[in-house]
């Protein structure tokens, strides 16, 4: 996983890098495998209905460097793992849901049965 | 200077197996993949496969899916084509060649005849 | 499968003239990175291929400035500004966008 504290520009990789993809397979991609310049990625975030979604998939090195960082948004819970030391790495990458803070309950909507 | 040398011309009836190698040399072979690539006689280019040899891993063409093997020995800086049971049609020369986002250097090439 | 049509199919111009040849996809080469992973290759009678032009228009170490690549998408252009008596070969586009990987049929230039 790329650490929060990582600033350098990232550096284009000699070679193509293949990834597992997962509702985030682009036209290109074949057999849910995509190929990328930058990383492959596994996200775990919530839908509309609070359900845990998991996508995966690739990143091209353009921006990569930032959405791989995982900051956090406000009123939105997920989190991503991204990783290049080997093709198909993301299939290995279980990133979780950070937990619910207090007022996620309060500022949230309020879902009836 | 990149470099990558192939084994030499085989003779070979149907039926037989085949191994031929390309050796890199002047680069880092695990930080580029290596494809094959299939020219029969005065045909034009074809794409078998390639691995990368850092990790092993293979991509092939549905059409020479099951026909072939790729495999690479990092230690030695080699990739192979192999074959466990040859037939008329395979006979043509075979490029391995090197792949980062494309192919910029080739092997000389190895002619593979299958007669009986 | 992608397929990959040049034309013509054998081209003699001129010493000293330019030849075009042109190299059409059956689906855009347009990479989700943005790149477009077209390029050409010249092979000569007997040797193996030649990477001359990668990426639509970046010409590979060593080539010649008079060979140039042009196009997006789905149509694309090698030309030699100025035909040599040593670039008699046949060219292949070939396009590493999409798996499986697959060239053109080439096209073969000779002197006229």
């Known amino acids: 996983k790329k650490e929060d504290g990582e600033s350098t520009a990232p550096t284009p990789r000699p070679k193509v890098l293949r990834c597992k993809c997962h509702h985030h397979c682009p036209e290109d991609s074949v057999n849910n495998i995509c190929s990328t310049d930058g990383y492959c990625f596994t996200m775990i975030e919530e839908d509309d209905s609070g359900l845990p979604v998991v996508t995966s998939g690739c990143l091209g090195l353009e921006g990569s460097d930032f959405q791989c960082r995982d900051t956090p948004i406000p009123h939105q819970r997920r989190s991503i793992e991204c990783c290049t030391e080997r093709n198909e790495c993301n299939k290995d990458l279980h990133p979780t849901l950070p937990p619910l803070k207090n007022r996620d309950f309060v500022d949230g909507p309020i879902h009836h049965r | 200077e990149v470099q990558l040398v192939q084994s030499g011309a085989e003779v070979k009836k149907p039926g037989e197996s085949l191994k031929i190698s390309c050796k890199g040399s002047?680069?880092?072979?695990?930080?580029?993949?290596m494809q094959w690539v299939r020219q029969m006689p005065g045909k034009g280019l074809e794409w078998m496969g390639e691995i990368d040899p850092s990790d092993q891993y293979t991509l092939y063409n549905q059409k020479f899916k099951g026909q072939v093997t790729i495999s690479a020995d990092k230690s030695i800086s080699t990739a192979y084509l192999q074959w466990s049971s040859l037939k008329a049609s395979d006979t043509a020369m075979y490029y391995c060649?090197?792949?980062?986002?494309?192919?910029?250097?080739w092997g000389q090439g190895t002619t593979v005849t299958v007669s009986s | 499968d992608i397929v990959m049509t040049q034309s013509p199919d054998s081209l003699a111009v001129s010493l000293g003239e330019r030849a075009t040849i042109n190299c059409r996809s059956s689906q855009s080469l347009v990479h989700s990175t943005g790149n477009t992973y077209l390029h050409w290759y010249q092979q000569k009678p007997g040797q193996p291929p030649k990477l001359l032009i990668y990426?639509?228009?970046n010409r590979f170490s060593g080539v010649p400035d008079r060979f140039s690549g042009s196009g997006s998408g789905t149509d694309f252009t090698l030309t030699i500004s100025s035909l040599q008596a040593e670039d008699v070969a046949v060219y292949y586009c070939?396009?590493?966008?999409?798996?499986?990987?697959?060239f053109g049929q080439g096209t073969k230039l000779e002197i006229k």
């Open positions: 060649a090197r792949f980062g986002y494309y192919v910029d250097y």
């Open positions: 990426k639509v228009s």
């Open positions: 002047g680069y880092s072979f695990t930080s580029y993949w």
């Open positions: 070939s396009q590493s966008t999409h798996v499986p990987f697959t």
